[in-house]
């Protein structure tokens, strides 16, 4: 089965953990995609070792274990992720998580105080 | 951005040939790598592909005559005794197993083994 | 051993047809199927992968379908700038295969 944190959120600018937690007493875990949405973050074979897809090469970091390490985090990576366990003998298993990415307390706090500056 | 960087030249027979590509923007140490050719006039041929980890896979034809490893920065394809029959463009590219694609390209480099 | 065969090899369209080139696969590769443009004296481009996905600034016109060990590449509303050469690669297994990739398919446009 898959164990993971249903849904999580981070700062803009930030980063953020993303894990999926495989246990099983029979099968061995062959291969692990990570997804957003449709599109590949990464994957992991035990043949070949980690590849984090070009389009996210700068900003996202294989582990721990066989996680992400997801950084520089911008508004639009709020959504959909999905890890996909590829094991043997056992077979897909696949999690989900839903991330949101909120704006900085930083921001906020500035917003904050820019609001009940005075006027004049 | 990744970018991929190769250079050939023209060879004899009896060199070892050895191909160096240069990647930037990326790291080797979470990237798969890969080698194509392509003869003149002919189809895409896959060489074979290098894993983060170092691990290797070679097309059966590529066996024991082709070599690929790695720096931190650099992949390398020799090819020992190489024949004219090895007379081809070479691109290295980024991925090539269960990656959604090999992307980016580099923009391939002629090598001619000629006596 | 996984073996690609494209069809045809070449093909003759004109500007606003259709062209649709095939791919079979000798044994099931799970939609891990790619295509790939060429045109002379440049590296191949990244067209659609996982079979049907647009990668990043590829034009609608182009598609991919297919599932098993079928697939196809379909260029609707054909344009001058296509003609140029296509290849499948599968990305299933790299482990005792001679080629990942398809033989390629000529498209001229008249």
């Known amino acids: 089965t898959i164990d993971t944190k249903r849904n999580i959120s981070a700062e803009e600018g930030g980063s953020v953990i993303l894990q999926c937690h495989f246990s099983s007493d029979t099968a061995e875990v062959t291969q692990v995609d990570w997804k957003q949405q449709d599109q590949l973050l990464a994957i992991y074979s035990v043949d070949l070792g980690w590849h984090v897809a070009s389009v996210f090469s700068d900003r996202v970091v294989p582990g721990p274990s066989l996680g992400l390490t997801f950084q520089s985090l911008t508004m639009n990576d709020t959504g959909e992720y999905f890890c996909t366990y590829h094991t043997y003998p056992g077979g897909i298993y696949k999690g989900r998580i839903f991330l949101k990415v909120q704006e900085s307390s930083d921001d906020r706090n500035g917003l904050a105080q820019f609001q009940t500056a005075p006027l004049g | 951005q990744v970018q991929l960087e190769s250079e050939g030249g023209l060879f004899k027979p009896t060199d070892t040939l050895t191909l160096t590509c240069t990647v930037s923007g990326s790291s080797l140490s979470s990237s798969y790598m890969s080698w194509v050719r392509q003869a003149p006039g002919k189809g895409l041929e896959w060489i074979g592909i290098?894993?983060?980890?170092?691990n290797t896979y070679y097309a059966n034809w590529a066996k024991g005559r082709f070599t690929i490893s790695k720096t931190s920065t650099t992949v390398e394809l020799k090819i020992t005794s190489p024949t004219t029959e090895d007379t081809a463009t070479y691109f290295c590219a980024r991925g090539g197993y269960r990656t959604s694609g090999m992307d980016p390209w580099g923009p391939g480099t002629l090598v001619t083994v000629s006596s | 051993d996984i073996v690609m065969t494209q069809t045809p090899a070449s093909v003759e369209v004109a500007v606003g047809g259709t062209v649709t080139i095939k791919c079979q696969a000798s044994q099931s590769i799970s939609s891990y199927l790619n295509w790939y443009q060429q045109k002379p004296g440049q590296p191949p481009k990244l067209l659609i992968y996982?079979?049907?996905k647009l990668a990043s600034g590829v034009p609608s016109r182009f598609s991919g379908s297919g599932s098993g060990t079928e697939y196809t590449l379909t260029i609707s509303g054909v344009e001058s700038a296509d003609a140029a050469t296509y290849y499948c690669?599968?990305?299933?297994?790299?482990?005792?295969?001679?080629?990942?990739f398809g033989g390629g398919t000529e498209v001229v446009v008249k």
């Open positions: 690669q599968q990305e299933h297994s790299v482990g005792n295969v001679d080629n990942v």
């Open positions: 290098i894993g983060s980890n170092g």
């Open positions: 996982d079979a049907l």
